[in-house]
C-alpha cells in the first residue's frame, strides 16, 4: 500500500520562503521500501558521532558511576544521534586517547547504555513521526524567534566536532514556543546522510529526508544546561527536514562554503553572523511537537521537540557538499550521523494544525485518533 | 591622529615576492581587524586579505585570487601590519591599501581609515 | 560571492544639482552596505556605513538608503569638490565585494 499524497497544505509540504514543492506520493517510500526495525544495516550504514549544546563554553555533567566515565557537555550531540540502524540500540565507544571524555559512535561498543543509562529510557528521540495519529492542538502557537537575525560581526564559531558540524550561537537569541515557554538558542547543527542517502533524524511516515537541522535552545528557567538535562522542558530543539531544490539557499551556503576549512576532525572557523532563521522554514505556525530525549549520549530526557511541518530547500550541490565534505574519526568520513528512530511507547504527538486532515475528496469528517494534551502546562 | 602607511611597494618579476608594512598609530591596533584592499590601474576596488583582532585570535582570511600565495600577518607590539606576497602574477599589479575595518563594538566590515596604498607592479 | 551592480557607471552633473546612485546587490545583505568616494591619485574615503549612516565629518549632503538588494546614495546639492568616484561595498560576509563605481562628472 502506498502512503498517502501530501498535499500543499498536508504535513510537509511547500517549503521554505515557497521554494519547495509538496511532498508527492512519488517522493514517498512504498512500505517495503521503508526502513525495517529488525534489518539493522551493515558496517558500511552505520554513522560518525555526534555532540550538544554549547561544548567547552558548558559546564561538566557529573557521571552517574565509574563505569559511565567523565561525560563532559562537549560530549553529548548536538541533540542528534545515530544512522539508518533499524533497532533501537544506541552504541557507542571509548576513545582509548583523550582526556578521559566520553566518545562513542554509532553501531559500535560499548552500548550507549553503558555510556548513559538515560539512553535505554522509554521516551527517547528522534521519532517516526504519523501525521494521520498526531492530535490536533490548537493551543499550539505560532513560534516566536527573536533576536535570531545577527549582524555580520562579531563571527561565529564554526567546528567539526568529529560527528557534526556546529555552530556555536551567541546570547541574546530568544524563542517562545508559547507564553510561559520561554527559551535561549545555544547553536544548531546538521545530520546528513551520504551519496544517494538521506540522513535526517526524525522520519515522516518511515521516509528519511536528506538532511536535519537541530536548533537547541536553554529554558529560562534554568542558568545552565547541566541543570536542565533531564528536567521536562528544560532543553528544546527545534527541527526542520532539508530537501533537495532547483536553487541555491544563499543562507546555507554561508555555512556550506567554509565546510572545507573544517575538513578535519576537531578543527573550526569563524563565520560571519548571519539570520539564523533563514536557516529555518519560513512557516512558524505549523509543527509537530513531542517530548523526547538528545539523540545522543547523555541521551537525556524531558527535551521538547518541535518539527516544522514545512522543509527547507537547498540545492542538490549543496546537499552533496553537506554530505561529503567532513571527516570524522579514524580517516572515516562524517556521514550518516543520525540515530534510528526510537519507539514512541505510547507518547502522543502534537500538531499545531490539523495533519490529519486527508485531503482527497471523500474524506468528510477527519477522524482524529489522539486528542490534545494540555498544551503550555 | 588615526594614521596608516604603507611601504614596500616596487617592481618584481612574474613568480617573485615581495613584503608590503603598513605602520598604525593613533589608535588601539590590537582592537582592530586590518585589511589589505588593491586597485588595478583604472580598475576599481578589490579586498585582498584580512587579519582579525585581539577578541578573535588574529587569524587571517583571503580572498580567492590570493590564497595560498599571499600571507597577512601582525607584530602588535610594532602596531604593524604586513602582507607576504609570493609567485606574484601580473594580475597583481595594483596599488595596495592598508585598512582599518571592523572591531570589538562593530557590527559588520566597513573600512573607515586607508592608507595612502603603496604600488606594486609585476612585470618581466 | 555577492555581486554588486552599480548603477549608472558614469554620469555628468551640475553643481547644485541633486544626485542619486543605486546599487544592487545580488542577495539580501539587510543593510550590511557602505559607500565610498575616491578621488583621482587618492585613497577612498568612507561617507556613509550601515547603509544609512554618515561617517564622521562627511557633509549632510550625502545620504544613505536602502536595505536587502537596492541602495541609494544621494547627494541633495552637488558642490564642485563631489566630482569623483563612487563605490558601494557589502560587509555581510567575505569575500568583501564591492561595486565597478560610478564616476560623478562635471556636466
Known amino acids: 500500500q502506498r502512503l498517502p499524497r501530501m498535499q500543499e497544505d498536508s504535513p510537509l509540504g511547500g517549503g521554505s520562503s515557497g521554494e519547495d514543492d509538496p511532498l508527492g506520493e512519488e517522493d514517498l517510500p512504498s512500505e517495503e521500501d521503508s526502513p525495517r526495525e529488525e534489518d539493522p544495516p551493515g558496517e558500511e550504514d552505520l554513522p560518525g558521532e555526534e555532540d550538544l549544546p554549547g561544548e567547552e563554553d558548558l559546564p561538566e555533567v557529573k557521571p552517574k558511576s565509574e563505569e559511565e566515565g567523565s561525560l563532559k557537555l562537549e560530549d553529548l550531540p548536538t541533540v542528534e544521534a545515530p544512522g539508518d540502524p533499524q533497532e533501537p540500540q544506541n552504541n557507542a565507544h571509548r576513545d582509548k586517547e583523550g582526556d578521559d571524555q566520553s566518545h562513542w559512535r554509532y553501531g559500535g561498543d560499548p552500548p550507549w547504555p553503558r555510556v548513559s543509562p538515560a539512553c535505554a529510557g522509554r521516551f527517547q528521540s528522534p521519532v517516526d513521526i504519523r501525521p494521520q495519529l498526531a492530535a490536533f492542538c490548537p493551543a499550539l502557537r505560532p513560534l516566536e524567534l527573536l533576536g535570531f537575525q545577527l549582524p555580520p560581526l562579531p563571527e561565529l564559531r564554526l567546528r567539526n566536532n568529529g560527528h557534526s558540524v556546529q555552530l556555536t550561537l551567541p546570547p541574546g537569541l530568544e524563542m517562545a514556543l508559547g507564553p510561559g515557554r520561554e527559551y535561549r538558542a545555544l547553536q544548531l547543527h546538521l545530520h546528513w546522510g551520504a551519496a544517494g542517502r538521506p540522513g535526517s533524524e526524525h522520519t515522516v511516515e518511515g521516509h528519511r529526508f536528506p538532511a536535519e537541522i537541530h536548533v537547541v535552545h536553554l529554558s529560562t528557567a534554568f542558568a545552565r544546561v547541566d541543570e536542565a538535562l533531564g528536567r521536562p522542558g528544560g532543553l528544546a530543539v527545534l527541527a526542520a527536514f532539508l530537501e533537495e531544490g532547483p536553487e541555491e539557499n544563499s543562507a546555507y551556503e554561508q555555512l556550506l562554503s567554509r565546510l572545507e576549512e573544517i575538513a578535519e576532525e576537531g578543527s573550526e572557523t569563524q563565520v560571519p553572523g548571519l539570520d539564523i532563521s533563514a536557516l529555518l522554514p519560513s512557516d512558524f505556525s505549523r509543527y509537530f511537537q513531542y517530548e523526547g530525549s538528545l539523540t545522543t549520549p547523555p541521551c537525556a530526557q524531558g527535551v521538547i521537540w518541535t518539527v516544522f511541518n514545512q522543509t527547507v530547500m537547498l540545492s542538490a550541490k549543496q546537499l552533496h557538499t553537506l554530505s561529503d565534505t567532513l571527516w570524522g574519526p579514524g580517516d572515516s568520513r562524517l556521514q550518516l550521523n543520525f540515530r534510528a528512530t526510537q519507539p514512541l511507547n505510547g507518547r502522543v504527538i502534537e500538531a499545531s494544525f490539523p495533519a490529519g486532515v486527508d485531503s482527497s475528496p471523500r474524506a468528510a469528517e477527519p477522524v482524529q485518533l489522539n486528542s490534545c494534551l494540555a498544551a503550555g502546562d | 591622529e588615526v594614521q596608516l602607511v604603507e611601504s614596500g611597494g616596487g617592481l618584481v618579476q612574474p613568480g617573485g615576492s615581495l613584503r608590503l608594512s603598513c605602520a598604525a598609530s593613533g589608535f588601539t591596533f590590537t582592537d582592530y581587524y586590518m585589511h589589505w584592499v588593491r586597485q588595478a590601474p583604472g580598475r576599481g576596488l578589490e579586498w585582498v586579505a584580512f587579519i582579525r583582532n585581539k577578541a578573535s585570535g588574529y587569524t587571517p582570511q583571503y580572498s580567492a585570487s590570493v590564497k595560498g600565495r599571499f600571507t597577512i600577518s601582525r607584530d602588535n607590539a610594532e602596531n604593524s601590519l604586513y602582507l607576504q606576497m609570493n609567485s606574484l602574477r601580473a594580475e597583481d599589479t595594483a596599488v595596495y591599501y592598508c585598512?582599518?575595518?571592523?572591531?570589538?563594538?562593530?557590527?559588520?566590515?566597513?573600512?573607515?581609515?586607508w592608507g595612502k596604498g603603496t604600488t606594486v607592479t609585476v612585470s618581466s | 560571492d555577492i555581486q554588486m551592480t552599480q548603477s549608472p557607471s558614469s554620469l555628468s552633473a551640475s553643481v547644485g544639482d541633486r544626485v542619486t546612485i543605486t546599487c544592487h546587490v545580488s542577495q539580501n545583505i539587510n543593510v550590511w552596505l557602505s559607500w565610498y568616494q575616491q578621488k583621482p591619485g587618492e585613497a577612498p574615503k568612507l561617507l556613509i556605513y550601515q547603509a544609512s549612516n554618515l561617517h564622521t565629518g562627511v557633509p549632510s549632503r550625502f545620504s544613505g538608503s536602502g536595505s536587502g538588494t537596492d541602495f541609494t546614495l544621494t547627494i541633495s546639492s552637488l558642490q564642485p569638490e563631489d566630482f569623483a568616484t563612487y563605490y558601494c561595498?557589502?560587509?555581510?560576509?567575505?569575500?568583501?565585494?564591492f561595486g565597478q563605481g560610478t564616476k560623478l562628472e562635471i556636466k
Open positions: 585598512v582599518r575595518g571592523g572591531h570589538a563594538g562593530s557590527n559588520y566590515w566597513y573600512f573607515d581609515v
Open positions: 561595498q557589502q560587509g555581510q560576509s567575505y569575500p568583501f565585494t
